[in-house]
């Protein structure tokens, strides 16, 4: 019997009864948060052989071994993982051994066994026989092996029953418990599983089988299960499901869901029955079970229950990630925030259509609305009082709406309103009227010419660059000296520059009023000599890198209530000169004959220009005399080079004896101080542990229902 889609057993150990008769758990198995120590001996689930996702055990009091609960669990497929892990055993206070003596395969993912104070028999299991790669396993903070005294069956009687393998240069017996060996198949089976009698299973079997070389006798399938047979691929007119079995179209159509997309049911795509179309695809019609590629970003309709979505933080913006059509109204009220412009772009940058109105008020953190970089249509199906569908009020630092040279925005219905935006030039608002098709809809008071742009130098003159000089890491630029009507109104210039691989940047990219700015800024004082053109040397730049540069004149903005003219340049794109590339990476050499060497390498990480060729140099080295000191044809052991003597197990030392020469003949060494790299590694390790623990807690703790 297939159980699923994931079983969560918590608080009450009697919930374990839900596992009765399950042969396959299609999904995960959580057993957790059972705080009262119970006697689990009466609970046994011998039918359970496969978990298709992962197994998670966390804080289950009184459970001493998993072997009695799941004596025949053979395969954990890891089709979906818990933070990259297929088996997690965390803070199991009473667990003494894992004991899953029939576990033969974890198909995908690693294991994490951490903070189990009583857990032994960890060093006796060879995980490389179960997993493809053991490098990502995390086994930390359990009972120290020295306190365990793990003994495999028969060792005490000097009649060892288990087989040996090598782990970390230690050749030892492999077992799960004091009376259960770790099963190993004969080498003749290769990668194939085997029966209890060591006969090789069919290649399509995984873990084990009840009869040799029979694809209907597998305990689990290497690829897919269909109609009692293990098959390498699903037959025609059937589809992969949950990574392990084949189902027909009717089955797929009749899956009921209680997840986000359940209004439309499951789909069939690329030979698989799945919950939703994958990224880049959309259903071919709302009732369709098939997917077609999207043109551009896939449409995602988002709806706000309360009709108006207030964006007052990054967190609230996060809810709109991926949305292309927003059904409702947007109220943007961003007073403060860190790196707000790029965060908002990340979460709201795909919105193309807003069906209601857009209102931006008291958003003092915003300099530009360019974070809504794909907005092309405001329908105005719902409007604010006064028939406004675009309303901009009291935004103290708003300077730009959008870059109208690269923006098409239509406001289908409703008027615009602008007031108390002191840095927003009226010319910018008038330009929006033209682009959006709202010109003529607004009445006189809708765009206030007195309190919009009152603190900005609006009517800008253009500053022209007069010369540019480049080297590998420097740019020198000069520009015409700007002369406003009254020279005292000109204070200084500000040069803005940044890396720009493409010629598509705008002045307001990544800029907000809280200090975040993707542009580097340099102030340039006026040259004392009126005939000298202002200029700057930008240094510390990267070789062969394109930079965007523009200059702004810093002027007094108010002269007796008249707007005065400001000045800024166009954006100039300029590339630094090429330089010597960094060294080629990962150089490998191997000999494939007595007279040839094959040398391979990867390109340098910093080419610093267009690479045209490589120079390979080589020279003959004298032969190492050490190689001739031993007769390699003799049966004696090849000598092992000894590099240092006199070291002892650090753990055995209670006080560090002081020695003058570390590693010499004068006695044991002090523990060397940790290198910066080791300290950093320890810090990262501690950080990683915290991140995992947070993930665990966030995933499994849910608030009590009211």
């Amino acid at each position: 019997e297939i159980c699923g889609p994931g079983i969560d057993i918590r608080n009450d150990y009697q919930q374990l009864k839900r596992l009765e008769n399950c042969t396959v758990i299609e999904g995960y198995l959580h057993i957790l948060l059972i705080s009262k120590a119970e006697d689990y001996r009466s609970y046994r689930f011998p039918k359970l052989t496969v978990i298709t996702e992962y197994l998670l055990l966390f804080r289950v009091a009184g459970l001493e071994s998993l072997g009695d609960l799941f004596p025949n669990l053979t395969v954990i497929r890891g089709w979906k993982l818990f933070y990259n892990y297929a088996l997690v055993i965390f803070e199991m206070t009473n667990l003494k051994d894992i004991g899953l003596y029939n576990l033969r395969n974890i198909t995908r993912g690693a294991i994490r066994i951490e903070k189990n104070a009583d857990l032994c028999y960890l060093s006796t299991v060879d995980w490389s026989l179960i997993l493809d790669a053991v490098s990502n396993n995390y086994i930390v903070g359990n009972k120290p092996p020295k306190e365990c005294g793990d003994l495999c069956p028969g060792t005490m009687e000097e009649k060892p029953m288990c087989e040996k393998t090598t782990i970390n240069n230690e050749y030892n017996y492999r077992c799960w418990t004091t009376n259960r060996c770790q099963k190993m198949c004969p080498s003749t089976c290769g990668k194939r599983a085997c029966t209890e009698n060591n006969e090789c299973c069919h290649p399509e079997c995984l873990g084990s089988c009840s009869a040799p070389d029979n694809d209907t006798a597998c305990v689990a399938c290497r690829h897919y299960y269909y109609a009692g047979v293990c098959v390498p691929a699903c037959p025609p007119n059937t589809y992969r499901f949950e990574g392990w079995r084949c189902v027909d179209r009717d089955f797929c159509a009749n899956i009921l869901s209680a997840e986000s997309s359940d209004s439309e049911g499951f789909v069939i795509h690329d030979g698989e029955c799945m919950q939703e179309c994958p990224s880049g695809f959309i259903r071919n019609g709302s009732q369709s079970m098939y997917c077609i590629p999207c043109e551009g970003p896939c449409p995602k309709v988002c709806e706000e229950e309360k009709k108006t979505k207030t964006i007052d933080s990054v967190t609230s913006a996060q809810m709109l990630q991926g949305c292309t059509i927003f059904k409702g109204n947007l109220l943007i009220n961003i007073r403060r925030g860190n790196n707000i412009a790029s965060e908002l772009e990340n979460f709201m940058g795909l919105i193309e259509v807003v069906t209601g109105y857009v209102k931006i008020r008291h958003s003092h953190a915003l300099v530009s609305l360019s974070f809504l970089k794909n907005l092309r249509l405001i329908l105005g199906e719902e409007q604010l009082e006064g028939n406004y569908s675009f309303y901009v009020l009291d935004n103290q630092n708003l300077q730009q709406l959008w870059d109208w040279d690269h923006r098409n925005l239509t406001i289908k219905a409703g008027k615009m309103y602008f007031a108390f935006n002191p840095k927003l030039c009226v010319s910018e608002i008038y330009r929006m009227e033209e682009v959006t098709g709202t010109k003529g809809r607004q009445s006189k008071g809708d765009i206030n010419t007195r309190n919009n742009g009152e603190r900005a130098s609006c009517e800008s003159d253009v500053l022209h660059f007069t010369s540019t000089t480049t080297s590998k890491n420097r740019i020198i630029i000069t520009w015409h000296r700007y002369r406003p009507p009254d020279y005292r109104d000109l204070i200084s210039f500000t040069v803005y520059y940044k890396e720009a691989p493409f010629k598509n940047v705008t002045e307001y990219d990544g800029q907000d009023a809280c200090g975040s700015n993707s542009w580097n800024m340099v102030d340039v004082d006026l040259p004392p000599n009126k005939d000298v053109e202002p200029g700057i040397l930008l240094h510390g730049l990267k070789p062969w890198t394109q930079y965007a540069v523009y200059v702004k004149a810093v002027t007094l903005t108010m002269v007796e209530n008249d707007h005065i003219r400001g000045a800024k340049s166009e954006i100039l794109y300029i590339r630094t000169n090429a330089s010597v590339p960094s060294i080629p990476l990962d150089v490998l050499s191997a000999s494939n004959s007595s007279s040839q060497l094959i040398v391979k390498w990867n390109p340098p990480s910093l080419p610093n220009g267009n690479l045209s060729y490589y120079i390979v140099r080589w020279q003959r080295q004298p032969q190492d005399g050490y190689l001739y000191r031993h007769n390699y044809c003799s049966k004696d052991k090849i000598p092992i080079r000894k590099y240092a003597d006199g070291t002892i197990d650090i753990e055995e030392v209670t006080e560090n004896p002081k020695t003058e020469v570390c590693g010499g003949e004068k006695g044991p060494c002090c523990a060397c101080p940790k290198t910066e790299a080791e300290k950093q590694a320890e810090k990262e390790e501690a950080e990683y542990r915290k991140v995992f623990e947070n993930f665990l807690h966030n995933s499994i703790f849910v608030p009590r229902p009211e």
Epitope: E1, I2, I7, C22, F251, I255, S257, A258, S263
Partner: nanobody, 123 residues
Framework: EVQLVESGGGLVQPGGSLRLSCAAS????????MAWFRQAPGKGLEFVSA????????RYADSVKGRFTISRDNSKNTLYLQMNSLRAEDTAVYYC????????????????WGQGTLVTVSS
């Protein structure tokens, strides 16, 4: 943990109608696929109908198609089964069941079950 309580069962004449209700408490109701099963005297458990979390999709056993309608009200945490044109063979104890996330057509082992309500169709 989800608690389910069925109501609305009783004696009804053939051709008559009955509406069963199932009140759920505990976790977020909409995150469960809900179903009705029944067990006739001396018989095994039989699937009747199931409904998706939003209530937009439903599935019925062939024996009840066109006669029974399953629905849910997520704001009231309640599942319903409207039974029309009842027959003698519909006599059974009707159980309400809930399964988190989703339910495949071959799933009979739902995670949570009610105690059942008896429906008797007899003249």
């Amino acid at each position: 943990e989800v608690q389910l309580v069925e109501s609305g069962g009783g004696l009804v004449q053939p051709g008559g109608s009955l509406r069963l209700s199932c009140a759920a408490s505990g976790r977020t109701f909409s995150s469960f696929v809900m179903a009705w099963f029944r067990q006739a005297p001396g018989k095994g458990l039989e699937f009747v109908s199931a409904i998706s979390g939003s209530g937009r999709q439903a599935r019925y056993a062939d024996s009840v198609k066109g006669r029974f309608t399953i629905s849910r009200d997520n704001s009231k945490n309640t599942l319903y089964l409207q039974m029309n044109s009842l027959r003698a063979e519909d006599t059974a104890v009707y159980y309400c069941a809930a399964n988190p996330r989703r339910a495949t057509p071959d799933l009979s082992r739902y995670a949570y079950w009610g105690q059942g309500t008896l429906v008797t169709v007899s003249s």
